[in-house]
């Protein structure tokens, strides 16, 4: 059954990242995941981030220098920005982000949280706080070993969400994450927006960005 996976708040205060481990999720076909840029809290500096979908070697090196695939820029203090990823079986068009079963995919940021560091392409919170999301598509959290994993990188999508079209496994080599240091998101059904839109928030806004 398709689920709305537990939303991930992209914040240095998120305990899932504070543990110093990457965050691993196990999406199934039809699942949706919201990544949230939280709005500013009174008395706390707003955290500016640019999130990328990256290759495994980029995630490991915390580098987005080469061919970065930007997903969303967290740069609006006034509002929550919600980026929804849909894991679906078939791509809606030729630009669809195609994610294959039994492959790993990575989201991270090399920004450092400050406005000045928004465009950083090396290090950042990827390195200092291990703020990475590892998406193990169509995999069993109780039966995964790094040696069994293959990895690829999706193409780009032209609809309003990232729609991950899963296909038969490929063979790009055994590039799965192997450090074993990951937090796991449970697969509970979540009530909430589950919006198919690229973002949502309050108060809605436009310009608070860089």
């Amino acid at each position: 059954l398709a689920k709305n996976l537990e939303p991930v708040s992209w914040s240095s205060l998120n305990p899932k990242f504070l543990s110093g481990k990457g965050l691993v999720i196990y999406p199934k076909i039809g699942d949706k995941l919201d990544i949230i840029c939280p709005r500013a809290e009174a008395g706390r500096p707003y955290e500016y981030y640019k999130l990328y979908l990256v290759r495994p070697e980029q995630a490991a090196a915390c580098s987005t220098v080469l061919d970065p695939n930007v997903l969303v820029t967290c740069n609006r203090p006034e509002q929550e920005i919600r980026f929804t990823i849909k894991f679906q079986e078939f791509s809606p068009n030729y630009m669809g982000l195609e994610f294959k079963k039994h492959h790993d995919y990575y989201i991270t940021s090399t920004s450092n949280g400050s406005l000045e560091g928004l465009e950083n392409r090396e290090g950042g919170v990827c390195r200092t706080r291990t703020m990475k999301i590892i998406m193990k598509v169509g995999q069993d959290p109780n039966a995964v070993t790094p040696e069994q994993l293959t990895t690829s990188r999706p193409s780009k999508e032209a609809d309003n969400t990232v729609k991950m079209a899963t296909q038969a496994p490929g063979s790009r080599g055994s590039l799965g994450d192997s450090d074993g240091k990951h937090e796991t998101v449970n697969q509970e059904e979540k009530s909430g927006p589950g919006a198919s839109g690229g973002s949502s928030g309050d108060p809605d806004g436009f310009f608070n960005s860089k």
């Epitope: 820029t73 006034e78 406005l115 000045e116 973002s199 949502s200 809605d204 806004g205 960005s209």
Partner: antibody, heavy 111, light 107 residues
Framework: QVQLKETGPDLVHLTQTLSITCTVS????????IHWVRQPPGKGLEWMGA???????DYNSAFKSRLSISRDTSKSQVFLKMNSLQTDDTAKYFC?????WGQGVMVTVSS | ETVMTQSPTSMSTSIGERVTLNCKAS??????VDWYQQTPGQSPKLLIY???SRHTGVPDRFTGSGFGRDFTLTITNVEAEDLAVYYC?????????FGSGTRLEIK
């Protein structure tokens, strides 16, 4: 209730400096970012620059070093200054923040 | 800088029709695109932010979609008050850039 209001001259002479003040209410300048956008008569919108909530600024390089944006948080005001005005700087100048725009101030550059 | 190319430049439609306005970015910008409506003599008004989220109070006749480079604003069941110029905006990096606008005329 968020409000923004631009005040400035209607007419500026060629090569002189334009100064516009954006006075805001309903929010703090340390929380929201303020942007300046202009629109020449009958034409489209052009982003000029921003005063970020943390006090930093960014500018559209199209304005080179002619443009300066500053603020006075105690007065809830953001200031735009642009020098060496030419006739093609004739435009309506807006300040804006997330969901709200000022009404704009129409500035004509004359010789 | 990211160039936003809007099409068509202008279009004419009838009350009740459905129209699609397009905006193409010169490079991938994720979901960092907004849509504005500027009616004659008025300041621009936010319709859609983050590519697809409707701003508060905007009728659900207005729908935004897109990711990466291609974005669309769809207006279903066009009303007379929709006579306006519509602009897309890229806000993911400096400088922010507007499209040149699409003028919607009502027959």
């Amino acid at each position: 209730q968020v409000q923004l209001k631009e005040t400035g001259p209607d007419l500026v002479h060629l090569t002189q400096t334009l100064s516009i003040t954006c006075t805001v209410s309903g929010f703090s300048l340390t929380t929201y970012n303020i942007h300046w956008v202009r629109q020449p008569p009958g034409k489209g919108l052009e982003w000029m620059g921003a005063m970020w909530n943390g006090g930093g600024t960014d500018y559209n390089s199209a304005f080179k070093s002619r443009l300066s944006i500053s603020r006075d948080t105690s007065k809830s005001q953001v200031f735009l200054k642009m020098n060496s005005l030419q006739t093609d700087d004739t435009a309506k100048y807006f300040c804006a923040t997330p969901t709200d725009w000022g009404q704009g101030v129409m500035v004509t550059v004359s010789s | 800088e990211t160039v936003m190319t809007q099409s068509p430049t202008s279009m004419s439609t009838s009350i009740g029709e459905r129209v699609t306005l397009n905006c193409k970015a010169s490079q991938s910008v994720g979901i960092n695109v907004d849509w504005y409506q500027q009616t004659p003599g008025q300041s621009p008004k936010l319709l859609i932010y983050g590519a697809s989220s409707r701003h508060t109070g905007v009728p659900d006749r207005f729908t935004g979609s897109g990711f990466g480079r291609d974005f669309t604003l769809t207006i279903t069941n066009v009303e007379a008050e929709d006579l306006a110029v519509y602009y897309c905006l890229h806000y993911g990096s400096i400088p922010f850039t507007f499209g040149s606008g699409t003028r919607l005329e009502i027959k």
